[in-house]
Every structure is written in structure tokens, then in C-alpha cells.
Amino acid sequence: YDFTNCDFEKIKAAYLSTISKDLITYMSGTKSTEFNNTVSCSNRPHCLTEIQSLTFNPTAGCASLAKEMFAMKTKAALAIWCPGYSETQINATQAMKKRRKRKVTTNKCLEQVSQLQGLWRRFNRPLLKQQ
């Protein structure tokens, strides 16, 4: 999906209003210095591409974040403010249902969500030069 046509200001507002708090809740009990940010993004469409990938694609050691509250809200925000996003996700959602696993918070998942927090922070500051 090409995130170029999303309403970035609305997605930012959704993040600041509620998604950010759910990410903090997920990470509660974890020191903010515990994980290094290794994933970066260069502009808002690229940030949303990376956020979608880290949130919804299973990775080794972290099978699924998709049922977490922050993930459900992220999916909803993209569906509302990225034209055509919902339609592209129908097949992906059906595939995900087939491989759904029980929720387990592993250290790998915590690391992944820490990366997500970094990507969201970057998304919210699009005019900053890349380090």
C-alpha cells in the first residue's frame, strides 16, 4: 500500500490522543533505555510503511502484535485516514486469522514495540533532518 495520500495530521492526532498511551501501557515496566532504536524512517509515508510492517507482520520471536490495543487502533486509523487502505488489507486479515496465536509478551515483542515508539515519534516530527 502507498501511504502517500493519507491524512497525516489526522493520523498524528489519533496517535497523540490515544495510540501513544496504549504503546506506553504495553511497555510499562520497561526502561526507556533498554532497547536501541535500529529501525528508522525518512518521511511520513515511509514511517507509516515501517509502522505497518512492524505492527502487523509476524517476526521471529514475536508472532503477533495485531491483537494488542495499539495495533487495533493503528489499523483503524489507517483504515479511516488512508484512502483505500481497508480494501488492501482484506486478504492480509484473512491470512492472519488462520495463523492467530495466543498473546504472549516476549522480550522480542517489547523490543519491537520500542522500535514502533521510535517510528511514531519520527512520524510526528517530519521536518527533522535524518540523523
Partner: nanobody, 132 residues
Framework: QVQLVESGGGLVQAGGSLRLSCAAS????????IAWFRQAPGKEREGVSF????????YYADSVKGRFTISSDNAKNTVYLQMDSLKPDDTADYYC?????????????????????????WGQGTQVTVSS
């Protein structure tokens, strides 16, 4: 240009009723979501109720569930908030607000409807005072 005009506020005794109206113009009403917010003196603006004009889906804040009813008349481009069993705690300025994408994504909007930062257009407000 876009306009939202609220009316129907006033002074009412506890246990009484009021019906607020929000008349909209300047945009395609059927595509939009309209929400009612309220702000009491010294408090933050809070979401009261939401309706999708495209499918009629409605959401309510817990504090008003069972007492307030939101409805929409698409022919008149107007949204109503029927407020029954009013309490002194309901005293506030009431505002209606419109948003252009949540109206056609009402199921996903359950997470976001109550956040004022997401709305594009606002009315000037109408005052509701509930005396004990």
C-alpha cells in the same frame, strides 16, 4: 463555507429534558460524522455522542448512556441530541463538530470519536444549565 449552528440550550431543572440541534451547511452531510462535545467551566472538552450520517452508527460517553439519544435528519442536514433525566453535572457549553472520514468508517471510529483534535469543523456552542 462550512457552518455548524447549535441551538436548543437553556436552563432546566434536574430530571428535565432538552433537545439540542446542530444545523450543518457547506459540506456533503451524508459523508460526515457529527459529534457532540461539552465543556464545563474549568474542565476539558469531552466527547458526549457521535453519529455517522452515512449509516446511523451512534456512540455515547458512559456518563450519558441511557439518558441521551443522538439522531440525524439527512434531509434537513441536522443532528439532534435529545437529553433526558438531566443532572446538574450535565451543565456545560455544548458544541457540535464534524469530521469528513469517520462518517464512512463508523466501525473503526469507535476508538477515536471522543477526541476533539480529530474534528475539522466546530460550531459556536449552546449553553445548558441544569439546576438542582
Amino acid at each position: 463555507q462550512v457552518q455548524l449552528v447549535e441551538s436548543g440550550g437553556g436552563l432546566v431543572q434536574a430530571g428535565g429534558s432538552l433537545r439540542l440541534s446542530c444545523a450543518a451547511s457547506g459540506f456533503i452531510f451524508d459523508d460526515y460524522a457529527i459529534a457532540w462535545f461539552r465543556q464545563a467551566p474549568g474542565k476539558e472538552r469531552e466527547g458526549v455522542s457521535f453519529i455517522s450520517n452515512s449509516d446511523g452508527t451512534a456512540y455515547y460517553a458512559d456518563s450519558v448512556k441511557g439518558r441521551f439519544t443522538i439522531s440525524s435528519d439527512n434531509a434537513k442536514n441536522t443532528v439532534y441530541l435529545q437529553m433526558d433525566s438531566l443532572k446538574p453535572d450535565d451543565t456545560a457549553d455544548y458544541y457540535c463538530a464534524a469530521e469528513g472520514r469517520m462518517g464512512t468508517h463508523s466501525r473503526d471510529s469507535v476508538y477515536f470519536w471522543a477526541f476533539s483534535a480529530l474534528y475539522d469543523y466546530w460550531g459556536q456552542g449552546t449553553q445548558v444549565t441544569v439546576s438542582s
